[in-house]
């Protein structure tokens, strides 16, 4: 039985130029995580295998750092980057939790910046 | 339990193609969080190669992005690895993995030789 919850930051938003991370949290849950997978709509973004490692998408390879844990680090923000992320844990033997992060990325220095996760 | 087999393997002349299949059998828990390709080069580290998700989301390493392509056939619980261009310096031993959604650890195959001549 699926016992865990994801905890996400959520909606967030950054300036253009600058940096986020994007955070996951799975809780009430003993089981094991086997795979987290980042994804942005219909692109995959990262994998972090807990016996491969990370692995990061080419096209995103410069902008994109893994962690911290198992968040993930985006650097150089485009108005193109706001939109949905989804980390999805797999784990063993609860099986697939999906959390949802919504990004927008604003042009001036309005952005209301979500301390805890933002990088100055 | 879950075995991989990988076929496809062989010699081939450079500029030539080749198709990897990799069979997952026994219990594969209906369905995997990831299935890539690595390959291991004689006196080399494994190299990442490709990975696709059971959403069919891939991931390809930048030396074979353009050249290699991975798709599923989920019914069929295999994975493939189409390999065009093929160089000297993509001989190697090609593994497949996966990690099932209900299982602990990632699955490796066995491997297939494949040898590009010049």
């Known amino acids: 039985m699926m016992t865990g919850t994801i905890e996400t930051t959520g909606n967030i938003s950054a300036e253009k130029g600058g940096s986020i991370i994007l955070q996951c949290h799975l809780s009430s849950t003993t089981a094991q995580v086997t795979q987290v997978n980042w994804e942005q709509q219909d692109q995959l973004l990262a994998i972090c295998n807990a016996d491969l490692g990370w692995h990061i998408s080419p096209s995103f390879k410069d902008r994109v750092a893994p962690g911290p844990g198992l968040g993930l680090t985006l650097q150089s923000l485009t108005v193109n980057d706001t939109g949905e992320y989804f980390c999805i844990y797999h784990t063993y033997p609860d099986g697939t939790y999906t959390g949802r992060i919504f990004l927008e990325v604003l042009e001036s220095s309005v952005a209301e910046h979500g301390a805890r996760f933002q990088i100055p | 339990e879950v075995q991989l087999v990988e076929s496809g393997g062989g010699l081939v002349q450079a500029g030539g193609s080749l198709r990897l299949s990799c069979a997952a059998s026994?219990?594969?828990?209906?369905?995997?969080?990831?299935m890539g390709w690595f390959r291991q080069a004689p006196g080399k580290e494994r190299e990442f190669l490709a990975i696709?998700?059971?959403?069919?989301?891939?991931l390809y390493a930048d030396s074979v992005k353009g050249r290699f392509t991975i798709s599923a056939d989920n019914a069929k619980n295999t994975v493939y690895l189409q390999m065009n261009s093929l160089k000297p310096e993509d001989t190697a031993v090609y593994y497949c993995?996966?990690?099932?959604?209900?299982?602990?650890?990632?699955?490796w195959g066995q491997g297939t030789q494949v040898t590009v001549s010049s």
């Open positions: 696709i998700t059971d959403g069919s989301k891939t």
């Open positions: 993995a996966a990690q099932f959604i209900l299982a602990r650890h990632l699955v």
């Open positions: 026994g219990r594969t828990f209906s369905s995997y969080a990831m």
